[in-house]
């Protein structure tokens, strides 16, 4: 299985969809689990309704909800109020007996809210930077200085 990346914004909701063959997985409950380490077990977070015919009903565990469109063949997981600690590897699973087939491997990435930066407190305004071509450099995540290069001075 390839891993599908889903990106969400911190504090907002993220919907993860896992398509599957509805005939092949007919009658099977589904689950959403979190991968614990590269080779570790997949820890169950939430699963669909105990009665397969009621799989369309939303089931919730904390901020995570799951619902299954068994006819269309789409499992949907919603992560509410996404937080940095929600980032990581997950799986959508199809359950049969004590076994579980992987429907999709998922990587959840949590992006900083553009209005909720860690640098939200710096009172930056564009008008003070407008005259400096590279004023944004000091805010980039990482930047290597070339030999002999002088770091760009703060704008204020």
């Amino acid at each position: 299985h390839n891993t599908t990346v889903f990106q969400g914004v911190e504090g907002q909701s993220l919907q993860v969809s896992c398509p599957y063959d509805s005939m092949k997985h007919w009658g099977r409950r589904k689950a959403w689990c979190r991968q614990l380490g590269e080779k570790g077990p997949c820890q169950r977070v939430v699963s669909t309704h105990n009665l397969w015919l009621l799989s369309f009903l939303r089931r919730r565990n904390g901020s995570t909800a799951i619902t299954d469109d068994t006819l269309g063949g789409t499992l949907t997981i919603t992560l509410r109020n996404l937080q940095p600690h929600d980032a990581g590897f997950y799986q959508c699973q199809s359950l049969h007996g004590s076994e579980a087939d992987t429907l999709r491997k998922v990587l959840v990435e949590v992006l900083a809210d553009p209005l909720d930066h860690r640098d939200a407190g710096d009172l930056w305004v564009p008008g003070e930077s407008e005259s400096f071509e590279d004023a944004h450099v000091e805010h980039s995540i990482s930047r290597s200085l070339l030999e002999g290069e002088i770091p760009f001075p703060p704008t204020s």
């Epitope: 553009p114 209005l115 909720d116 930066h117 860690r118 640098d119 939200a120 407190g121 710096d122 009172l123 930056w124 305004v125 564009p126 008008g127 003070e128 930077s129 407008e130 004023a135 944004h136 805010h139 204020s156």
Partner: antibody, heavy 122, light 113 residues
Framework: EVQLLESGGGLVQPGGSLRLSCAAS????????MGWVRQAPGKGLEWVSA????????YYADSVKGRFTISRDNSKNTLYLQMNSLRAEDTAVYYC???????????????WGQGTLVTVSS | DIVMTQSPDSLAVSLGERATINCKSS????????????LAWYQQKPGQPPKLLIY???TRESGVPDRFSGSGSGTDFTLTISSLQAEDVAVYYC?????????FGGGTKVEIK
């Protein structure tokens, strides 16, 4: 739930002093710039002052520069505005507001407190 | 300092009709590095503090109904309420977030005709 609660307003004589406080809750206060905006009775909004998250930067409107001092105590989640040499034209509702923004966004005010009334009169 | 000028001072519009508020800045608030205009709009209902509606001239704050829209660039901006509702009665302010000192427009009062 994010809450900002101003206090310290009241009636003061011209030339007098007042210290306004704004108690913040429901968010990580120390991550955010904060500001004061005032509104004279029946008038529009006037930005007064702002302070960066770590208190390293402060800004003031020309109308209050040299008379007002903004400060914050991140350990107490509280913003302050020390107002000296008050004038009749400083009479207004003073709102405390969180400065939403950051690099590439620029400072906008949200959310706001309910405000505290400062009346300067003899 | 950037001076913000709003027009009209007040506006009476029938329910369901369009309301248009203008805001002009004394200098451009367009940041060339990202091509964004640093202009915000606020709504202040009677007896309440202001509420942020729009930033970057046209980006709606989450939870703001889509009947509110912002447009314009450089120095001339518009807030449009496409279909006025009773709950939209308020004073609307523009604010530049381009340069310190931050400045607000004088406000536009929107009423129902």
């Amino acid at each position: 739930e994010v809450q900002l609660l101003e206090s310290g307003g009241g009636l003061v004589q011209p030339g007098g002093s007042l210290r306004l406080s704004c108690a913040a809750s429901g968010f990580t206060f120390s991550n955010y710039g904060m500001g004061w905006v005032r509104q004279a009775p029946g008038k529009g909004l006037e930005w007064v002052s702002a302070i960066s998250a770590n208190a390293g930067k402060t800004y003031y409107a020309d109308s209050v520069k040299g008379r007002f001092t903004i400060s914050r105590d991140n350990s107490k989640n509280t913003l302050y505005l020390q107002m000296n040499s008050l004038r009749a034209e400083d009479t207004a509702v003073y709102y405390c507001a969180s400065l939403r923004g950051g690099y590439e966004v620029g400072p906008t005010f949200d959310p706001w407190g309910q405000g505290t009334l400062v009346t300067v009169s003899s | 300092d950037i001076v913000m000028t709003q027009s009209p001072d007040s506006l009476a519009v029938s329910l369901g009709e369009r309301a248009t508020i203008n805001c002009k800045s004394s200098q451009s608030v367009l940041y060339s590095s990202n091509n964004k205009n640093y202009l915000a709009w606020y709504q202040q209902k009677p007896g309440q503090p202001p509420k942020l509606l729009i930033y970057w001239a046209s980006t709606r704050e989450s939870g703001v109904p889509d009947r509110f829209s912002g447009s314009g660039s450089g120095t001339d901006f518009t807030l449009t309420i496409s279909s006025l509702q009773a709950e939209d009665v308020a004073v609307y302010y523009c604010q530049q977030h381009y340069l310190w000192p931050i400045s607000f427009g004088g406000g536009t009062k929107v009423e129902i005709k």
